[in-house]
Interface confidence: low
Amino acid sequence: KIVLDPSGSMNIYLVLDGSDSIGASNFTGAKKCLVNLIEKVASYGVKPRYGLVTYATYPKIWVKVSEADSSNADWVTKQLNEINYEDHKLKSGTNTKKALQAVYSMMSWPDDVPPEGWNRTRHVIILMTDGLHNMGGDPITVIDEIRDLLYIGKDRKNPREDYLDVYVFGVGPLVNQVNINALASKKDNEQHVFKVKDMENLEDVFYQMIDESQSLSLCGMVWEHRKGTDYHKQPWQAKISVIRPSKGHESCMGAVVSEYFVLTAAHCFTVDDKEHSIKVSVGGEKRDLEIEVVLFHPNYNINGKKEAGIPEFYDYDVALIKLKNKLKYGQTIRPICLPCTEGTTRALRLPPTTTCQQQKEELLPAQDIKALFVSEEEKKLTRKEVYIKNGDKKGSCERDAQYAPGYDKVKDISEVVTPRFLCTGGVSPYADPNTCRGDSGGPLIVHKRSRFIQVGVISWGVVDVCKNQKRQKQVPAHARDFHINLFQVLPWLKEKLQDEDLGFL
């Protein structure tokens, strides 16, 4: 598999058949698949060197692994997008052997002297062809030469099979399956041959290809493959339940932010709630996690403005649940990214010198910002797309707080909507879905560069649109939701999470 280890060394060779039998639309589809693969790999913070070859009668090398920019995913993608099916129009045979020889030439070293560290570099060849090679001889001989060059399969004690993976995608109207199977790597419990049909569900393909065991602690990563559970898609999501004898129970959501902490809303708890009455589950697991302590933001006080006629005041409505035992990260349990951390800088592929302010400008610019929250409907977690009104619609969004029960007498809306809040909901630019009571404490998320970054904590809503746990279809335009802006509570987060190795900026 493609081992995505941020500290490892890897070369990926993209080889694309542009011969007559492929057809323009299949060529374009194959290109799109490779673009998506480059993006998927880059989302792990891994920077392999890429080689890029197209071929028909002759190969054409577009990017050499030795080039300075070959590890710049955006640049390689740009080169790939500029390739045209017509580039091989005049000589349109299928010489797969020559194409693989071009890959061999990129792998080999001048004067046959292996460079330092050559044996620690993993090589991945991704060949997209219909297998209908009709000139140049059998390409399998070049695969044998490559194995020889990389010293693979020679030493029984150290066969080094991990250092070469050949993936073959069958593209085009007709595919010679025998030829394709012959070229691909054969490894136990791994799939190295994919069909055109598979390319329609690329996330499934990447799931078969990628070994992410070295990067499970990366924040904001998800798997969207079809066989994945809700928690592959939202691995940070935590379900919180507070049992109150004789009073029933309160349900909330939260987000895993580190191996020991879940971030949620303070209003999910009362000061009387004992740790043993708080149930937290993650990863869709049945068992509840043991809780050490719930840490409230010191400025949170729901009764803080009762005297002023404001029955409930949600400013600083955030809390951290500290777990007794360390979470074991896996594909269904991993943290979400927090603002102003090194992890988020890497997730957004920003320079290491990026400041907190620059992250804020990236994630919360002064405009309508596409975001999402996760809600449970009929026992299934679903993503709901909303827009944070952070530009010209911000004022009207906040003013609609006056329609919330108990806030009708508030003279100045800033009494209840403090600078700590982000506002979503309403019908412009689109009709946003609203949060339900059980969504409280869950993350408000911005999805960028294939990663998920939490920018807010769901706090309160103007209208209860979820009578009997069913989200109503028709809701008034003033149905707004308010979320604690994490950029506004960073000092507290930084202090409480200081031992969690999140690298706050």
């Epitope: 011969s19 007559d20 039998s21 057809g23 323009a24 639309s25 099916y85 017509e86 129009k89 349109s92 209908l132 109207p173 007709l174 055109v196 049909k197 598979d198 329609e200 569900n201």
Partner: antibody
Framework: EVQLVESGGGLVKPGGSLRLSCAAS????????MSWVRQAPGKGLEWVAT????????YYPDSVKGRFTISRDNAKNSLYLQMSSLRSEDTALYYC????????WGQGTSVTVSS | DIQMTQSPSTLSASVGDRVTITCRAS??????VAWYQQKPGQPPKLLIY???TRHTGVPDRFSGSGSGTDFTLTISSLQAEDFATYYC?????????FGQGTKLEIK
């Protein structure tokens, strides 16, 4: 605007031959695979042949294999279907269509095989 | 060969109705399914390809869904000009095949 115009249809006796043509315009013809699809009177659609964009590869269903030949002349923006050993069941309206799936179709040319 | 079975063969509906036509493939075709509309005396017109992608210029009342073996074409609110015959088509593998057609007529 993509345009496909078929011609060459007509009445032919069983066992006879006919050559259909399709003139293409409004797009880069050499970039696209092309197909022939037929429709018998009052019936559904049946795929007849496909040719790759540069003409090196051709595909047929068993019902016409060995009797029909699809070809193209990219310099002339033209697609052809040479039909021989015609049978009464080949009677249909023959459409030429672009790419796969077929995104643009001509108006069709009628072929009648009858004695 | 992959058989494409459409149902129903005939469908009577009124303007404004929501109608659904289904198509079942005899084996897995991924999402390589297209839908065509054909009116008498005219060639077929591509509506949907790759199961759910609307072709250029096709009104958004037409939508497609499905993958594997079961596919659906939905017209959310029938207009007078939508009465026609509809065909599904698999473009996954040779031989390319079509459904037998669904005739949508005025009730």
């Amino acid at each position: 605007e993509v345009q496909l115009v078929e011609s060459g249809g007509g009445l032919v006796k069983p066992g006879g031959s006919l050559r259909l043509s399709c003139a293409a315009s409004g797009f880069t013809f050499s970039n696209y695979a092309m197909s022939w699809v037929r429709q018998a009177p009052g019936k559904g659609l049946e795929w007849v042949a496909t040719i790759s964009n540069r003409g090196s590869y051709t595909y047929y269903p068993d019902s016409v294999k060995g009797r029909f030949t699809i070809s193209r002349d990219n310099a002339k923006n033209s697609l052809y279907l040479q039909m021989s050993s015609l049978r009464s069941e080949d009677t249909a309206l023959y459409y030429c269509a672009r790419e796969r799936p077929m995104d643009y179709w001509g108006q069709g040319t009628s072929v009648t095989v009858s004695s | 060969d992959i058989q494409m079975t459409q149902s129903p063969s005939t469908l009577s509906a009124s303007v404004g109705d929501r109608v659904t036509i289904t198509c079942r493939a005899s084996q897995d075709v991924g999402t390589a399914v297209a839908w065509y509309q054909q009116k008498p005396g005219q060639p077929p017109k591509l509506l949907i390809y790759w199961a759910s992608t609307r072709h250029t210029g096709v009104p958004d009342r037409f939508s497609g869904s499905g993958s594997g073996t079961d596919f659906t074409l939905t017209i959310s609110s029938l207009q007078a000009e939508d009465f026609a015959t509809y065909y599904c088509h698999q473009h996954s593998s040779n031989p390319l095949t079509f459904g037998q057609g669904t005739k949508l007529e005025i009730k």
